[in-house]
């Protein structure tokens, strides 16, 4: 299973649920569906309040139980380490795949943390991070921000990912803006 890791803002905007949590248990495989679930302890929720309603405590995260069908495999054995998890809700359950944004909270830049806690949501409705994977690439809309990290640095963990958000400048226009300057 292969997929291009998204810009964190794209991950935030395209997810139903974005939380901070600790993985606290060994995965259990459902012997019927071949899905596995990880027990988690949620510490913060950044997106999904309305989608979840009253059931605002997520205790498990679900993923296919095999790599070939894009299952997520959690490698860290540190049960006190917090992770940012951006996933989809299916029948009220949090689902993730290899392609989901799952990262140690401590590995995120201060700007990314600011984005997840406050700023990315501002760009969700109007703006789109547009991946530039090969030259030439051009903006297809004024609301697009060209994401060139992979092209220029060969990594999704480049400057735009770690420090910028695609935010409205004026109606019909979005631009890359620094998250660093917005950190209190």
């Amino acid at each position: 299973c292969t997929c291009v890791p998204p810009h964190p803002q794209t991950a935030f905007c395209n997810s139903d649920l974005v939380i901070r949590a600790k993985f606290v248990g060994t995965p259990e495989v459902n012997q019927t569906t071949l899905y596995q679930r990880y027990e988690i302890k949620m510490t913060k929720m950044y997106k999904g309040f309305q989608a979840l309603g009253d059931a605002a405590d997520i205790r498990f995260v679900y993923t296919p139980a095999m790599e070939s069908v894009c299952g997520y495999f959690h490698r860290s054995h540190n049960r006190s380490e917090e992770f940012l998890i951006a996933g989809k809700l299916q029948d009220g359950l949090l689902h993730i795949t290899t392609c989901s944004f799952v990262a140690p909270w401590n590995s995120l830049s201060l700007a990314q943390r600011r984005g997840f806690t406050k700023t990315y949501t501002v760009g969700c409705e109007e703006c789109t991070v547009f991946p530039c994977l090969s030259i030439p690439c051009k903006l297809q809309s004024g609301t697009h921000c060209l994401w060139t990290d992979q092209l220029l640095q060969g990594s999704e963990k480049g400057f735009q990912s770690r420090h910028l958000a695609c935010l409205p400048r004026e109606p019909g226009l979005c631009t890359w803006q620094s998250l660093r300057s917005q950190i209190a």
Epitope: T26, Q31, T32, T33, L34, A65, E67, F73
Partner: antibody
Framework: QVQLVESGGGLVQPGGSLRLSCAAS????????MSWVRQAPGKGLEWVSA????????YYADSVKGRFTISRDNSKNTLYLQMNSLRAEDTAVYYC??????WGQGTLVTVSS | DIALTQPASVSGSPGQSITISCTGT?????????VSWYQQHPGKAPKLMIY???NRPSGVSNRFSGSKSGNTASLTISGLQAEDEADYYC??????????FGGGTKLTVLG
């Protein structure tokens, strides 16, 4: 009691086809993923293929991918393995197994000219 | 293509205890509590002796026990008896291959 009975094995020429069946009883068949495991003469065990309870997800070992097809009929409590383009190295006893626990007695497949 | 490592052979005298190890990785033995052990007598189908690391199916003697530490699982047979002489295979759920096996261990009961 829980029982799995394989059938359909036999002698087949290289390049030929064979369809194995596994009749299940004593448990709710559709509630379990099922798999096929094989054992070549004098060798160890090798996982071949698996299928989810609904039949919606299938998985294959690299050695059989593209040649073997696993399927199931939950209304008949039966698991199948369609084996095409058979090779000499596919010669083995084929076992049907429930998820990771109960096994059948096996059926011998011999690929030889 | 053996994914789990077992000793090729072990032996013990009647009444003794023996332990068979099964070493894998974090994506199989170490990552899941789904390790099974099978006993296979010549010409017979494998018989489940231990499942989910340490659980015994009904009808299996309590002389058989299983455990796991990190990426290594173990099968211990206490009070060894002549009928325990057989091949033993470990099996684990695996994130990449669904199901992986050890190469098998031939248990010889001496005397």
């Amino acid at each position: 009691q829980v029982q799995l009975v394989e059938s359909g094995g036999g002698l087949v020429q290289p390049g030929g086809s064979l369809r194995l069946s596994c009749a299940a009883s004593g448990f709710t068949f559709s509630s379990y993923a099922m798999s096929w495991v094989r054992q070549a003469p004098g060798k160890g065990l090798e996982w071949v293929s698996a299928i989810s309870g609904s039949g919606g997800s299938t998985y294959y070992a690299d050695s059989v991918k593209g040649r073997f097809t696993i399927s199931r009929d939950n209304s008949k409590n039966t698991l199948y393995l369609q084996m095409n383009s058979l090779r000499a190295e596919d010669t083995a006893v084929y076992y049907c197994a429930r998820f990771l626990d109960i096994w059948g007695q096996g059926t011998l497949v011999t690929v030889s000219s | 293509d053996i994914a789990l490592t077992q000793p090729a052979s072990v032996s013990g005298s009647p009444g003794q205890s023996i332990t068979i190890s099964c070493t894998g990785t974090s994506s199989d033995v170490g990552g899941y509590n789904y390790v099974s052990w099978y006993q296979q007598h010549p010409g017979k189908a494998p018989k489940l002796m231990i499942y989910d690391v340490s659980n015994r199916p009904s009808g299996v003697s309590n002389r058989f026990s299983g455990s796991k530490s990190g990426n290594t699982a173990s099968l211990t047979i206490s009070g060894l008896q002549a009928e325990d002489e057989a091949d033993y295979y470990c099996q684990s759920y695996d994130f990449y291959k669904f199901n992986v096996f050890g190469g098998g261990t031939k248990l010889t009961v001496l005397g």
